[in-house]
């Protein structure tokens, strides 16, 4: 192999170790934490990314605020169990044998239980609402320009097929991006909306997972779009199962 191949990197995942030991001396990359081979032509699954993040030095993280309307990721970071395809296993447990069921984006969707807890299937998150508030600007962004730029971003940067960006809503200073992807719609090779949303979330926080990136440089007609607050809501194909105690708390 060439000297250049010794310097191989994974553009879509900086939390990897790469070496030219693939077929024909091609660059092959493995995720930190799990050691699983990743496909650098597309996004790495959120499960493998969380696992890699837990194996790296700990970073502080601000938890999003809870909501009555949908699931939000209030449990923060945990070291997940991933299946051989890199997806979240339906049941997750911690070191103290406390277990819970998660959806396809790894967000808890049941009360916590013990090792006897059963999670029959991995329930798909089919609708993600990304709620952003941008910093004050001289005037409102043009809605169609904003819509076009966000759709371009999800297509080009996150490799998400345009049909999965259902809508972009804008009422200054709030921007809402709706991602929808049913099981029946997702073809082989399609990026999962949960993975795209996670990459976007990390980009917005200035913790880009892409090689060579610090954060996200977003501009609409040359005007910087700076996000000051992000909230992500997850809606599952099957409603979550929480006890009434939690719902009335």
């Amino acid at each position: 192999h060439t000297a250049a191949q010794d310097n191989c990197t994974c553009p879509t995942n900086k939390m990897t170790v790469c070496s030219p030991d693939g077929p024909g001396g091609r660059c092959q990359c493995r995720a930190l934490g799990s050691g699983m081979a990743v496909d650098c032509s597309t996004l790495t699954s959120k499960c493998l990314l969380l696992k890699a993040r837990m194996s790296a030095p700990k970073n502080a993280r601000t938890l999003v605020r809870p909501s009555e309307h949908a699931l939000v990721d209030n449990d923060g970071l945990y070291d997940p169990d991933c299946d051989p395809e890199g997806r979240f296993k339906a049941r997750q447990c911690n070191q103290t044998s406390v277990c819970w069921c998660v959806n396809s984006v790894g967000v808890r969707r049941t009360d916590k239980g013990d090792l006897s807890l059963r999670c029959d299937e991995l329930v798909r998150t089919h609708h993600i609402l990304i709620d952003l508030r941008h910093r004050p600007t001289a005037g409102a962004f043009n809605h169609s320009d904003l819509d076009a730029e966000l759709r371009r971003l999800f297509r080009e940067r996150y490799r998400l097929h345009p049909k999965f960006v259902a809508a972009v809503h804008y009422e200054q200073p709030t921007i809402q991006i709706e991602l929808r992807q049913n099981t029946s719609q997702k073809a082989a090779g399609d990026v999962d909306i949960g993975d795209a949303a996670y990459y976007f979330e990390r980009d917005i926080k200035g913790e880009s997972l892409f090689q060579g990136r610090g954060g996200l440089d977003l501009r609409v007609r040359g005007e910087p779009l700076q996000v000051e607050r992000t909230l992500i809501y997850y809606l599952d194909e099957i409603p979550p199962k929480f006890s009434m105690k939690r719902l009335t708390a």
Partner: nanobody, 125 residues
Framework: QLQLVESGGGLVQPGGSLRLSCAAS???????VGWFRQAPGKEREGVSC????????YYADSVKGRFTISRDNAKNTVYLQMNSLKPEDTAVYYC???????????????????WGQGTQVTVSS
């Protein structure tokens, strides 16, 4: 850090051809690569790009039908074949690599992570 080096520029007569090369210090697999140019006193503009996901290509209207972008991942190099050159093609040509899946007319230059130093192309009789 991916380092990019352009070569192949020079002085050519109108109607002539040049092939620019963009060689990378690391593997270019999975990177979207674009060619840009900056003429004296003008802003840098996109000329062409080749997507990492499906090797689809984009060309600026001003070069469509005359320029061809291609990649050789085994050599970690992207090429820009320039035919039927015109005096208005005179510029410094830069290549850039981005961790994008796709590129298009509307891809901003800031989406590209790594840039070369450029190679001069002069079209003059």
């Amino acid at each position: 850090q991916l380092q990019l080096v352009e070569s192949g520029g020079g002085l050519v007569q109108p109607g002539g051809s040049l092939r620019l090369s963009c060689a990378a210090s690391g593997t270019l697999d999975y990177w979207t690569v674009g060619w840009f140019r900056q003429a004296p006193g003008k802003e840098r503009e996109g000329v062409s790009c080749i997507s990492s996901s499906d090797s689809s290509t984009y060309y600026a209207d001003s070069v469509k039908g005359r320029f061809t972008i291609s990649r050789d991942n085994a050599k970690n190099t992207v090429y820009l074949q320039m035919n039927s050159l015109k005096p208005e093609d005179t510029a410094v040509y830069y290549c850039a690599a981005g961790s994008l899946g796709y590129c298009s007319r509307s891809t901003p230059q800031y989406e590209y992570d790594f840039w070369g130093q450029g190679t001069q192309v002069t079209v003059s009789s």
